[in-house]
């Protein structure tokens, strides 16, 4: 693993992909999505210590300034680097349709 | 302003572009950047309350799950939606060069 992928806080503590099982009610979609009624939501969760999965130079700057001014500048934050598409079946005026959403499920994560 | 741009926490408290004055020493660049010696770093800072500048549907999901499971799922986080380029003058093996960096300065912000 690259240095940027080794978590100094211990296994599973740093920014990574997590799967959260959720119902449509949990997601607030119960009234417009027919199926599936349960979803495996992949999202990015975890800490972003120095040099861990830094997305770009902005993330490096942010970490350096956070060290200097922790009350002013927050640490970088764990967010999706890319997304997986997902299909939802929903009601339409004419009946029922399969709809693709490209920005629902995180595919991989980095620190920004 | 759209509803998603009105901060319910009070002016300036929610996710927005901030400018932080920093020296090359602050940024950890003193040994490889010649100029400028000081930089106005634009970055995204602030809270991401419900429906505020949500980047996409993933951000909506994250907020809904954060409300249900705050100990497991963090709130969405304020990150750059796009970047402004910046030119740095740096030392090279052969002398000095102008180098453009596309991912240094946040241009605008959203919640993911």
């Amino acid at each position: 693993a690259r240095n940027g992928d080794r978590c100094p806080l211990g296994p599973g503590r740093c920014c990574r992909l997590h799967t959260v099982h959720a119902s449509l009610e949990d997601l607030g979609w119960a009234d417009w999505v027919l199926s599936p009624r349960e979803v495996q939501v992949t999202m990015c969760i975890g800490a972003c210590p120095s040099q861990f999965r830094e997305a770009n130079m902005h993330a490096q700057i942010k970490m350096n300034l956070h060290r200097l001014k922790p009350d002013t500048v927050p640490a970088p934050c764990c967010v999706p680097a890319s997304y997986n598409p997902m299909v939802l079946i929903q009601k339409t005026d004419t009946g029922v349709s399969l709809q693709t959403y490209d920005d629902l499920l995180a595919k991989d994560c980095h620190c920004v | 302003a759209r509803n998603g741009d009105r901060c319910p926490l009070g002016p300036g408290r929610c996710c927005r572009l901030h400018t932080v004055h920093a020296s090359l020493e602050d940024l950890g660049w003193a040994d490889w950047v010649l100029s400028p010696r000081e930089v106005q770093v634009t970055m995204c800072i602030g809270a991401c309350p419900s429906q505020f500048r949500e980047a996409n549907m993933h951000a909506q999901i994250k907020m809904n799950l954060h409300r249900l499971k705050p100990d497991t799922v963090p709130a969405p986080c304020c990150v750059p939606a796009s970047y402004n380029p910046m030119v740095l003058i740096q030392k090279t093996d052969t002398g000095v060069s102008l180098q453009t960096y596309d991912d240094l300065l946040a241009k605008d912000c959203h919640c993911v």
Epitope: S35, R37, E38, V87, V96, L98 | -
Partner: antibody, heavy 119, light 107 residues
Framework: QVQLVQSGAEVKKPGASVKVSCKAS????????INWVRQAPGQGLEWMGW????????NYAQKLQGRVTMTTDTSTSTAYMELRSLRSDDTAVYYC????????????WGQGTMVTVSS | DIQMTQSPSSVSASVGDRVTITCRAS??????LAWYQQKPGKAPKLLIY???SLQSGVPSRFSGSGSGTDFTLTISSLQPEDFATYYC?????????FGGGTKVEIK
Amino acid sequence: QVQLVQSGAEVKKPGASVKVSCKASGYTFTSYGINWVRQAPGQGLEWMGWITAYSGDTNYAQKLQGRVTMTTDTSTSTAYMELRSLRSDDTAVYYCARGPGQYADVDVWGQGTMVTVSS
Amino acid sequence: DIQMTQSPSSVSASVGDRVTITCRASQGISSWLAWYQQKPGKAPKLLIYAASSLQSGVPSRFSGSGSGTDFTLTISSLQPEDFATYYCQQASQFPITFGGGTKVEIK
């Protein structure tokens, strides 16, 4: 484990109706839809339609519209497919299958029910 | 309706051979393509979903690729139990449609 168990083989006369059942177990029945797919002897797979066990909403293949009705009984976790005005070319194995899921997957299939239409 | 065209309709191969089956959609279907294996008298079995994701329990010699309109199923080293008919299926929109099938036979 997740299972779909279908009713037994049927022999019907032309013009009659048939109702095939599909009992689900091993998962929350209302969380997924059920597709019905048929396969005539020696032929490929033909999608007939879909029903959500949650609300009863359906989507039927155009060519079967008016002849097919799909229903569910959530109390018994069972889906039903009724086909009316049977013709000899309706002779086929009829399958129920769960899905599509969030990745458009139709993942679990029943064992199939042979329906023969013959005078 | 989206038409799914599979080729070849049949292929003769030996154990250990690499077999490739292609499927073309009449319009873009993103990555919403699945591959099924069917043996005589049995229900279809899901092998690959979302174009390239291997269904749990399916051997890794099966792989899928493609997006948009052109998709491929590859069996890297054919095993005796792989002789069967293979179908592609799109679930990008209703009606869901299947390819005509590819029969993999023993040479």
